[in-house]
């Protein structure tokens, strides 16, 4: 064993998604000679770790190297073991995190400094564990999915690599629905970027790209559920809330400090005259609508349009690749399909949420209570984001297609993170030799 | 031929210091992680710590029987591989191998002859 | 961490026996186990990494298998020179421990 094992023609990267509900685990690889090639770096496992987001150890610091292990372990089946030490670890922590550094920056730095120090002790070569912000988040996003649809290569193909790719090199735009956030990239059509927070420019492959990209910190589908609660149990008379986005005959008991916990429903808190209220679910679409839009300030815009608290969006432009929440709760209620129109979206979600939780338990034995009882909200708030939010229209709509899953990569921050931290995405077009020609076969 | 000579051992007081080092010789030394193993009198094998490269922060890891007293270091453009230790307790006392692994990681296929530590008043 | 605990403490053999040594670690490390002859006044020597795979100008007599919890080194036909201390290593996880040892003597 005298001398180190000839590395493998192929590479690895791994990349932590700590998100605010979750943490996953996602192990790339790629032709070692080919890391300037657009489209070579792909996907090969995915490991959800089990247990909450990082930002709920707070107080238990101590059990995060345990709650990594699997994931970790996982990765060092995979990953050959020659490549272990030249394999690049990555963490990013997304609103979660910056949820709890609003709250305390001594707790998100412990919380960070207990993860590293846990990845540090594996036989890869950490790289670093940090909260990236709603912009990188954004950016990164849109980075992945136009990168595996093969929008950044110069080569204009005459077949599809995906069902929705279209030949031409226009990019598609991202939506992004998380836990506690929520992320919109796109490159507007010759409009100006009116607010500078929003404004992002590439040079990628040898092209220009002027991107407009925003977070809104507390729209994620979990912080949007809390808020609405928050809000709506202001005005209820007793403890007794009767929610239109829960099932008919749902029932479920809701502990205040737990609602005022998160800064995202610091704006509608007040002291009420009880610790627990219970939500008793009336299961109506139309009013689920009505107050999520209450969540919505639209009546404040300093600029020449907004989405809504007054933050700027320029008109809409191309097709938008939505992924994360949009595509795992519209995949659950079956709303994915090219096909199906907004109005049949709209339909099909009030007669979902009409149904009663006896029965949608029963339909769904399989799933979680948790997570089962949450799709009404999830799907009502997914269509009234869109909609009024983002001021998608019932003809724009078939311009969003739900991505999972493209080439067998999960469409997400992660990948277009991992390509930059590793200068896989070169700023100018690779220059062809004749070796090369072998890619495009 | 692939080496490691350690030196800097001797007699030193509970609660003294002494630095010990690692001259490398005959592999690339900056792009291996290096160890410390230690051997007190009769006894088994004890890992010290490792560092690893500049690539990784030169990251360090200690046995928990010296964290926060012995520190590892290395210099790759002398390579060479340091072991500072600090208050010094009678049970550091030992041979002290300077080790590393030139193919994959965590076992050791090139040791050093060793250098011994005494701590004793 | 991982505790690694050798059996026996001390084997008494002829030259020529087959002998087997055993090493049990306190959880699973898959086959990330690695076997050390020494010798008085010498450092370790790697015998076998990865529970089994052997090295380069080691003799063949020299064999591991095992994986998960359990680890064995035989030594097929023991021969004069192979009468030391035998140490085998957990390399799965951080802190690297360890056996104690098995002194391999002549009975």
């Known amino acids: 064993t005298q001398n180190k094992a000839l590395p493998e023609n192929v590479k690895y990267g791994i990349v932590l998604d700590a998100g605010s509900s979750h943490t996953s685990l996602y192990i790339y690889k790629w032709p070692a000679e080919k890391e300037n090639d657009t489209g070579v770096v792909h996907q090969v496992e995915e490991c959800r770790v089990k247990g909450p987001g990082i930002s709920k150890f707070v107080q238990k610091v101590n059990e995060i190297g345990i709650y990594l292990t699997d994931c970790m372990e996982r990765a060092r089946e995979v990953i050959p073991r020659s490549q272990h030490q030249e394999t690049p670890v990555y963490l990013g922590a997304t609103a979660g995190m910056r949820l709890l550094r609003m709250e305390s920056e001594e707790l998100a730095d412990r919380v960070l400094d207990v993860v590293e120090r846990s990845l540090s002790n594996y036989p890869f070569d950490f790289q670093g564990a940090r909260i990236i912000t709603g912009q990188e988040e954004g950016a990164y996003g849109w980075i992945t999915i136009n990168y595996l649809l093969g929008k950044f290569s110069q080569k204009t193909r005459w077949f599809s690599i995906v069902p929705y790719e279209t030949n031409n090199q226009e990019t598609f735009g991202a939506l992004d629905l998380g836990g506690a956030s929520t992320q919109v990239t796109f490159v507007p059509q010759n409009q100006t970027i009116e607010s500078p927070d929003n404004a992002l420019q590439f040079r990628l492959y040898g092209k220009d790209y002027n991107v407009y990209t925003h977070s809104f910190l507390c729209y994620g589908k979990d912080q949007a559920l809390w808020q609405k609660l928050a809000k709506d149990i202001q005005v209820a008379s007793n403890e007794i809330l009767r929610d239109p986005c829960f099932h008919p005959g749902y029932k479920k008991v809701v502990n205040v400090s737990d609602l005022y916990k998160t800064p995202c429903t610091k704006r509608f808190e007040m002291t009420l005259p009880f610790q627990q209220f219970e939500i008793q679910g009336i299961g109506n679409y139309q009013q689920c609508h009505q107050s999520i839009l209450e969540l919505f300030n639209t009546s404040y815009c300093p600029y020449s349009q907004c989405a809504f608290n007054g933050i700027f969006l320029p008109p809409l432009q191309g097709d938008f690749g939505a992924f994360s929440a949009f595509y795992f709760v519209m995949k659950f209620l079956n709303l994915t399909s090219e096909k199906v129109s907004q109005e049949k979206v709209t339909e099909m979600m009030k007669k979902f949420c009409a149904q009663p939780w006896e029965e949608i338990k029963t339909s769904y034995a399989g799933v979680k209570e948790k997570y089962l009882s949450e799709y009404c909200f999830s799907g009502t708030y997914i269509l009234s984001l869109l909609l009024q939010g983002y001021h998608f229209t019932a003809d724009s709509w078939e311009h969003i297609h739900f991505i999972g899953k493209i080439q067998g990569s999960d469409a997400g921050w992660t990948l277009g993170y991992m390509l930059n931290l590793t200068n896989m995405i070169p700023a100018e077009q690779p220059l062809s030799t004749p070796l090369s020609h072998s890619t495009y076969v | 031929e692939v080496q490691l000579v350690e030196s800097g051992g001797g007699l030193v007081k509970p609660g003294g210091s002494l630095r010990l080092s690692c001259a490398a010789s005959g592999f690339t030394f900056s792009k291996y992680w290096m160890n410390w193993v230690r051997q007190a009198p009769g006894k088994g094998l004890e890992w010290v710590g490792e560092i690893r490269l500049k690539s990784n922060k030169y990251g360090t890891h200690y046995a928990e029987s010296v964290k926060g007293r012995f520190t590892i270091s290395r210099d790759d453009s002398k390579n060479t591989l340091y072991l500072q230790m600090n208050s010094l307790k009678t049970e550091d006392t030992a041979v002290y191998y300077c080790?590393?692994?030139?193919?994959?990681?965590?076992?050791?296929?090139?040791w050093g002859q060793g250098t011994t530590v005494t701590v004793s008043s | 961490e991982i505790v690694m605990t050798q059996s026996p403490a001390t084997l008494s053999v002829s030259p020529g026996e087959r002998v087997t040594l055993s090493c049990r670690a306190s959880q699973s490390i898959s086959d990330y186990l690695h076997w050390y002859q020494q010798k008085p006044g010498q450092s370790p020597r790697l015998l076998i990494y990865y529970a089994s795979q052997s090295i380069s100008g080691i003799p063949a007599r020299f064999s591991g298998s095992g994986s998960g919890t359990d680890f064995t080194l035989t030594i097929s036909s023991v021969e004069p020179e192979d009468f030391a201390v035998y140490f085998c290593?957990?390399?799965?996880?951080?802190?690297?421990?360890f056996g104690g040892g098995t002194k391999l003597e002549i009975k």
């Open positions: 080790t590393t692994q030139l193919d994959l990681y965590w076992f050791f296929d090139v």
């Open positions: 290593q957990n390399g799965h996880s951080l802190p690297l421990t």
